[in-house]
């Protein structure tokens, strides 16, 4: 819990507490913004981002965005608040410990995005279907 000598200021989104009133730590995420990438046609890729940042607000999670168009491939790594859309999409998988890429519809490019909430989880981005719970075979395994 927040000790009495630490002042909880009004409207302070830097102090986030869980259901027990315990202060929530900020996430540690890879944060290189947009970089050119060689990640293509692979089950998973490393971000090759050497910068690990303390996310500014404790509610933020790690995000990775992979984009491919006619000219290049980029990988974006950031922190972001899952209550807010990113690139106009909701971070629906923000509670996941792994960054499992899901394709999003964007005209003129191939666009994948993932979010996750374990330390530096956006360093390893996963495209493989075997991690995707929309896979019926995996659902069968889960519910057996």
């Amino acid at each position: 819990t927040i000790p009495p000598h630490v002042q909880k200021s009004v409207n302070n989104d830097m102090i986030v507490t869980d259901n027990n009133g315990a202060v929530k730590f900020p996430q540690l995420c890879k944060f290189c913004d947009v970089r050119f990438s060689t990640c293509d046609n692979q089950k998973s890729c490393m971000s090759n981002c050497s910068i690990t940042s303390i996310c500014e607000k404790p509610q933020e999670v790690c995000v990775a965005v992979w984009r491919k168009n006619d000219e290049n491939i980029t990988l974006e790594t950031v922190c972001h608040d899952p209550k807010l859309p990113y690139h106009d999409f909701i971070l629906e998988d923000a509670a996941s410990p792994k960054c499992i890429m899901k394709e999003k519809k964007k005209p003129g490019e191939t666009f994948f995005m993932c979010s996750c909430s374990s330390d530096e989880c956006n360093d390893n981005i996963i495209f493989s279907e075997e991690y995707n719970t929309s896979n019926p075979d995996l659902l069968l395994v889960i519910f057996q």
Epitope: T1, A22, V23, F25, P26
Partner: nanobody, 120 residues
């Protein structure tokens, strides 16, 4: 009983340096990630820096990168924060805190804090 005791704060001119210390006792210091957190007057908490249990990896808020250095001496159960090129906006109470083993929820232990005032 777990105790965290910060020291080293004080009044310093802009551009100056200070070294904060946090003496830890009552727990296995070399097994925990440790943090420096600060709170400016009337403001919220700012997560300044963190260091892994073995000291091999460190993390910094953008606002202090290149100016502050976190370190630890596990043989002395002590956490440090070397603060260089201090600015007025670094004025705050600085707390050390231990991250609990269960992950991201809960500073289970805080120090009482040490006040750093940067002013000419």
């Amino acid at each position: 009983e777990v105790q965290l005791l910060e020291s080293g704060g004080g009044l310093v001119q802009p551009g100056g340096s200070l070294r904060l210390s946090c003496a830890a006792s009552g727990f296995t210091f070399d097994q925990d990630r440790m943090w420096w957190v600060r709170q400016a007057p009337g403001k919220g908490l700012e997560w300044v820096s963190a260091i892994e249990s073995g000291g091999h990896r460190t993390y910094y808020a953008d606002s202090v990168k290149g100016r502050f250095t976190i370190s630890r001496d596990n043989s002395k159960n002590t956490l440090y924060l070397q603060m260089n090129s201090l600015r007025a906006e670094d004025t705050a109470v600085y707390y050390c805190a231990k991250q609990n083993e269960s992950g991201r929820s809960g500073f289970d232990y805080w120090g009482q804090g040490t006040l750093v005032t940067v002013s000419s």
